[in-house]
Interface confidence: low
């Protein structure tokens, strides 16, 4: 650009565009400066004066170079089932993600809108698919020869111990009980303890329920177990 138009505001050449970190102001018909992240346009440019920028107020932010008249409001505080993985600053919004042991049942552009606790498989059921940041645990009934005696979101069905003499046969929720001599345990593939997933950023996923063996239970639920101390996240 010629020297006389190197400083904003300036009129762009016919068919030309404004430079990086500048915007074209329709009213002034000039290329004017954008405001940096953490600031907003307090006074718009004219033909003779450039944009006047000002810092964002508390609990507001701008993440990009901009010419917005007001900074954006940071999201509400994270609920008790979430952790704040990014604080609200003048340059970035607060990001809430689900805390460990929870998964994101309803995402938003950044972070998670609604967390749900990972389902716990009841005795007689083991983890078929472990929970992730965005999906619930899926439980399955323990197959013959395997059992789970725990209420857990990580334990899979384990093989019954093999007895020389069986005192009490095992079932889906109880290991076999041997009489006296030392038992051996059959080596079923994948008989391992699954790690608890750690929540980070998340995307939308459909809640996936899982069976339980609770007597007389019924309503088939799309979200996992919820402890008393759960925060409200709203839809």
């Amino acid at each position: 650009l010629p020297a006389q138009v190197a400083f904003t505001p300036y009129a762009p050449e016919p068919g030309g565009t404004c430079r990086l970190r500048e915007y074209y102001d329709q009213t002034a018909q000039m290329c004017c400066s954008k405001c940096p992240p953490g600031q907003h346009a307090k006074v718009f440019c004219t033909k003779t004066s450039d944009t006047v920028c000002d810092s964002c107020e508390d609990s507001t932010y701008t993440q990009l170079w901009n010419w917005v008249p007001e900074c954006l409001s940071c999201g509400s505080r994270c609920s008790s089932d979430q952790v704040e993985t990014q604080a609200c600053t003048r340059e970035q919004n607060r990001i809430c993600t689900c805390r460990p042991g929870w998964y994101c049942a309803l995402s938003k552009q950044e972070g998670c809108r609604l967390c749900a606790q990972l389902r716990k498989c009841r005795p007689g059921f083991g983890v078929a698919r472990p929970g992730t940041e965005t999906s619930d645990v899926v439980c399955k009934p323990c197959a013959p020869g395997t059992f789970s005696n725990t209420t857990s979101s990580t334990d899979i069905c384990r093989p019954h111990q093999i007895c020389h003499v069986v005192a009490i046969p095992g079932n889906a929720s109880m290991d076999a009980v041997c009489t006296s001599t030392s038992p051996t345990r059959s080596m079923a593939p994948g008989a391992v303890h699954l790690p608890q997933p750690v929540s980070t950023r998340s995307q939308h996923t459909q809640p996936t329920p899982a069976p339980s063996t609770a007597p007389g239970t019924s309503f088939l639920l799309p979200v996992g177990p919820s402890p008393p101390a759960e925060g409200s996240t709203g839809d």
């Epitope: 609920s79 239970t217 309503f219 799309p222 177990p225 919820s226 008393p228």
Partner: antibody, heavy 116, light 110 residues
């Protein structure tokens, strides 16, 4: 353990109406609540539910038309701007959010009539 | 998503006969289906959950079966007390659905 809906009455179209489901012998910090309605001579229609922490999910048709909220012993469901199509018996039902949950516990229902 | 289609809308059966009610989901809901019985002026009563598990206190003449998208409620040895409307209900996803219930089936006992 019991549930009882209240607040059902005759209202004119556009008049906001709040229905309350009062629980007895149930800990709403571990139980969730579902709202269902039934127009005269029609089937059951799911409205939405609220989880123990207070987060609410709604049927797609009910978003913006209904608001569900709760206290420690009650769950409220507001019809923001009732129309004659909202005339129905409204039920609340509770279930354990652990495992399947349990909806054998339903309130008797409360009748809402929207008429000019 | 997860629309529930219940058939027939109405069925007539003689005492001692058998009734079959079908419920179809528009997408797989695995085994997350419950059946309810409702009589006029009363609240719904749970009969079966997780597709085939009988709820406490429900007579064994009620039987649920199916998985995925196709489900069936069978009432064998029908009694006069079984005259009611029966609803299926999916429990796989409540987040963005129109209704979790089927349209209902009226059972008339002759």
């Amino acid at each position: 353990q019991s549930l009882e809906e209240s607040g059902g009455r005759l209202v004119t179209p556009g008049t906001p109406l709040t229905l309350t489901c009062t629980v007895s012998g149930i800990d709403l910090s571990t139980y969730a609540m579902i709202w269902v309605r039934q127009a005269p001579g029609k089937g059951l229609e799911y409205i939405g539910f609220i989880r123990p922490g207070g987060s609410a999910w709604y049927a797609s048709w009910a978003k913006g038309r209904f608001t569900i909220s709760k206290t420690s012993t009650t769950v409220d469901r507001e019809i923001t701007s009732p129309t004659t199509e909202d005339t129905a018996t409204y039920f609340c039902a509770t279930y354990d959010t652990y495992g399947y949950g349990d909806t054998r516990l339903w309130g008797p229902g409360t009748l809402v009539t929207v008429s000019s | 998503a997860y629309d529930m289609t219940q058939t027939p809308a109405s069925v007539e059966v003689a005492v001692g006969g058998t009734v079959t009610i079908k419920c179809q989901a528009s997408e797989s809901i695995f085994s997350y289906l419950a059946w309810y019985q409702q009589k006029p002026g009363q609240r719904p009563k749970l009969l079966i959950y997780y597709a085939s598990t009988l709820a406490s206190g429900v007579p064994s003449r009620f039987k649920g079966s199916g998985s995925g998208t196709q489900f069936t409620l069978t009432i064998s040895g029908v009694e006069c007390a079984d005259a009611a409307t029966y609803y299926c209900q999916q429990g796989y996803d409540f987040s963005a659905v129109d209704n979790v219930f089927g349209g209902g089936t009226e059972v008339v006992v002759k």
